[in-house]
Interface confidence: medium
């Protein structure tokens, strides 16, 4: 259901401003208040983990997903959108959120990013192309889209803890991740830090305390020496490819 909540999805694309999430130091085992599991009897535990997750905005999806109409050519019939798998390098795109972490949308194609492809003070602005099948870039659905943002911001990039709407609002080495009240700039995860991996596509609700994604050259994988009774609760950490 739209109200199901999973505490620990890694959905960090385009988070809103942090109302105040805190976090660990870049070298600590758990990064700054990223993806913290809820205590207190699973206060916000999700009920229906394995439903395709309905969404209205990319922010509600995982870092390896974007929000779009599920059926090709359906033109968003009934306005139903779900979280879909991100597009890999060289795949077609309409906006940055469609591309997998480490990539951005340039001239309608997902390209590798090196965190320096946007001049300081500019927000990424993708070129809208008619891909024919992805309809959630339409501006008429009542939800703001990254593609309709103004191209310039006139403030300096946000430091850790600054409220943000998207990762381009944050300084290098930080991503924009939800910290409940808002989205804030949090450190991109380093090797060995705990990360969050969705068990299955669309298996999450709106994450409240999000972790950033793993940094360049790292992937979120099960920690080899981590043995727990439940497969579903295995610890994932950022590891070298």
């Amino acid at each position: 259901t739209l109200n199901s909540v999973l505490i620990n999805s890694n959905a960090i694309k385009n988070l809103p401003p942090p109302l105040g999430g805190a976090g660990g130091q870049p070298g600590s085992a758990v990064s700054v208040a990223p993806g913290v599991l809820y205590e207190g009897g699973n206060k916000y535990q999700t009920l229906d983990n394995y439903q395709p997750y309905p969404c209205a905005e990319d922010e509600e999806c995982g870092s390896d997903e974007y929000c779009s109409s599920p059926s090709r050519g359906a033109a968003g019939v009934g306005g139903v959108q779900i979280c879909l798998a991100c597009r890999k390098r060289r795949k077609r795109c309409m906006r940055h959120a469609m591309c997998c972490p480490g990539n951005y949308c340039k001239n309608g194609i997902c390209m590798p990013s090196d965190h320096s492809h946007f001049p300081r003070g500019e927000i990424e602005e993708s070129i809208i192309e008619n891909l024919g099948n992805d309809h959630n870039a339409a501006a008429g659905d009542g939800y703001p889209r990254r593609t309709t943002l103004t191209s310039k911001i006139y403030h300096t990039k946000g430091q850790e803890g600054s409220v943000c709407l998207r990762s381009s609002d944050c300084a290098a080495g930080l991503c924009c991740a939800r910290h409940f009240w808002s989205k804030i700039c949090k450190p991109v995860l380093k090797e060995g830090q705990v990360c969050t991996k969705h068990k299955r596509k669309g298996s999450h609700g709106l994450e409240i305390f999000q972790r950033c994604y793993c940094g360049e050259g790292l992937a979120c994988r099960i920690q080899k020496d981590h043995h727990q009774a439940s497969n579903s609760s295995r610890l994932h950490t950022c590891q070298r490819h």
């Epitope: 739209l2 109200n3 809103p16 401003p17 942090p18 109302l19 105040g20 999430g21 805190a22 976090g23 660990g24 130091q25 758990v30 700054v32 208040a33 913290v36 809820y38 205590e39 207190g40 206060k43 916000y44 905005e57 509600e60 703001p144 850790e160 803890g161 409220v163 709407l165 939800r178 910290h179 409940f180 009240w181 808002s182 989205k183 709106l206 409240i208």
Partner: antibody, heavy 110, light 112 residues
Framework: EVQLVQSGAEVKKPGASVKVSCKAS????????IHWVRQAPGQGLEWMGW????????TYAQKFQARVTMSRDTSSSTAYMELSRLESDDTAMYFC?????WGQGTLVTV | QSVLTQPPSVSGAPGQRVTISCTGS?????????VHWYQQLPGTAPKLLIY???NRPSGVPDRFSGSKSGASASLAITGLRPDDEADYYC???????????FGGGTQLTVLS
Amino acid sequence: EVQLVQSGAEVKKPGASVKVSCKASGYTFTDYYIHWVRQAPGQGLEWMGWIHSNSGATTYAQKFQARVTMSRDTSSSTAYMELSRLESDDTAMYFCSREDYWGQGTLVTV
Amino acid sequence: QSVLTQPPSVSGAPGQRVTISCTGSSSNIGAGYDVHWYQQLPGTAPKLLIYGYSNRPSGVPDRFSGSKSGASASLAITGLRPDDEADYYCQSYDNSLSSYVFGGGTQLTVLS
């Protein structure tokens, strides 16, 4: 169980300072920000600022910038909010919040 | 004067549906910042009802729902009950103030 327990009610004279504490338990203190929100009698909620429990970095609402100091003691998992140069309209209930959990409130009467 | 505008009061009979609006601007709700809703009973701390526009924490009945349109958000309560009588606040972030902001609050009265 996550809990935020605040210090007891305070009565202060105008011009004085007050320091309210907020002791956290049931979670990793340094993984969260602590916000302070106040509510004058019969009035709405007003955000005062937050402190990053790990680094101690703070952000204050402009209105309180010159008078408020937020601090924390990681060894005791306690956050503090000190408000100086008190005036009668600072009479309010002061809440600390981890965003999803709130303290019970501390009544400060000036 | 609050940055987020709520009606001072609303009322309804038991079983009825009421909505509480929260009107912001392009620097808060309209900019895409989340809206959260709190219920506050007299003498208690605010309790989270809705977060991220429309998400309910567990334990909050599905009679409570939230939505957003443009620079406004609203809270709907169906099947009104006497114990719903409380103050309700919306909350967001305002980038022109660099501050978290609350609505002025709405007092809900359940008519007997």
